[in-house]
Amino acid sequence: ESGYAQNGDLEDAELDDYSFSCYSQLEVNGSQHSLTCAFEDPDVNITNLEFEICGALVEVKCLNFRKLQEIYFIETKKFLLIGKSNICVKVGEKSLTCKKIDLTTIVKPEAPFDLSVVYREGANDFVVTFNTSHLQKKYVKVLMHDVAYRQEKDENKWTHVNLSSTKLTLLQRKLQPAAMYEIKVRSIPDHYFKGFWSEWSPSYYFRTPEINNSSGEMDPI
């Protein structure tokens, strides 16, 4: 194959200036999958540069990416999802650099949504729930979620909880009373598919109750 050296000794002979990274999203638009690539150096002059993917495709040998400002993008049903594809940066017919990538190992899930927190007075806890479009998907159905929360005044002091369901209970006694909290969630593939964390969901803000002096318990909001 053109576009890369033929043995280990020459493997770094490619032009480092054109290093890039990609992520895939499966069933992102109905049954269509997407592949997004971008150069790691934002200063690369992309004027004449194109991306092409070949191999592990259905019915076609290669597909060309569309350029959307700084990113390159494909939306298609034609990913075989088994075997490695060769993704190349090209100028005309010349390949500048290529990567062999299995699209099932670079999956980035869609961000969770509808995050909310409900205080249960009787149970003295907070029930965190959120939704994910992946519950309806046929491929990347199993995700690990990362719920992160912090007291609003503690800028970088996030507490993280990993879970596989879309519901989490936070005990009231683990949180500061009468404080404003920010909470958000993201997802990563689990079971067969591999890849990257999704974007964070929009943050949700909630306030913990005051401590009730007579009982030592928090007052509801």
Partner: antibody
């Protein structure tokens, strides 16, 4: 053409270790994971584990955990499989195999016979 | 571990006739349309050779008399017209879950 060439046959005593090599050529070494599969005499195939030459990351069959170590040398495009605490039931042909995808094996080495005998 | 059971253990077929080998798994090896089942041919004294990957995709250079089908837990390798050079042991293999396991093999001979 794409080739995996393995080291020669070995005879070992029980309790010893063996290290088998597999040299890749004809493709970019870091593009594909390399795995080890063994076959006892007259028996079927058994996956032992694999290594990603790009990162050095490994995945081992739990059955061999603690006894098997897989390494790679990018400068020579070679991977190694070391199996320790050998016993007679480790007598087998050991194959290295390239993973064309997750996880099927599209190119195989010629095999290395390891005999464990006192 | 996922157990792969091949049937029959051995098969004698006349030249030019169809040979069918089955592989049943102890749990599903499919994720929707992604079927993580592969087939190999092994001749005496040689390493295995990949024939079919992803249940039905023919490996480059493999004659099109070989075909694969199936999903979930039941898969089939078919040789549409057996040739003398097809005498070998055939193995199925799953790759959905570590450890990646093989079937016990099916020996194909000429009747």
């Amino acid at each position: 053409q794409v080739q995996l060439v393995q080291s020669g046959a070995e005879v070992k005593k029980p309790g010893a270790s063996v290290k088998v090599s597999c040299k890749a050529s004809g493709y970019r070494f870091t593009d594909y994971e390399l795995h080890w599969v063994r076959q006892a005499p007259g028996q079927g195939l058994e996956w032992m584990g694999g290594i990603d030459p790009k990162t050095g990351g490994t995945a081992y069959n739990q059955k061999f955990k603690g006894r098997v170590t897989m390494t790679s040398d990018r400068s020579t495009s070679t991977v190694y499989m070391e199996l320790s605490s050998l016993r007679s039931e480790d007598t087998a042909v050991y194959y290295c195999a390239r993973s064309g995808g997750r996880w099927y094996f599209d190119v195989w080495g010629q095999g290395t016979t390891v005999t464990v005998s006192s | 571990d996922i157990v792969l059971t091949q049937s029959p253990d051995s098969l004698a077929v006349s030249l030019g006739e169809r040979a069918t080998i089955n592989c049943r798994t102890s749990e599903s090896v499919s994720i929707h349309l992604l079927h993580l089942m592969h087939w190999y041919q092994q001749k005496p004294g040689q390493p295995p050779k990949l024939l079919i990957y992803g249940a039905s995709n023919l490996e480059s250079g493999v004659p099109d008399r070989f075909s694969g089908s199936g999903s979930e837990t039941d898969f089939t390798l078919t040789i549409s017209s057996l040739q003398a050079e097809d005498v070998a042991v055939y193995y199925c293999q799953q790759s959905i879950k570590d450890p990646y396991t093989f079937g016990g093999g099916t020996k194909v001979e000429i009747k």
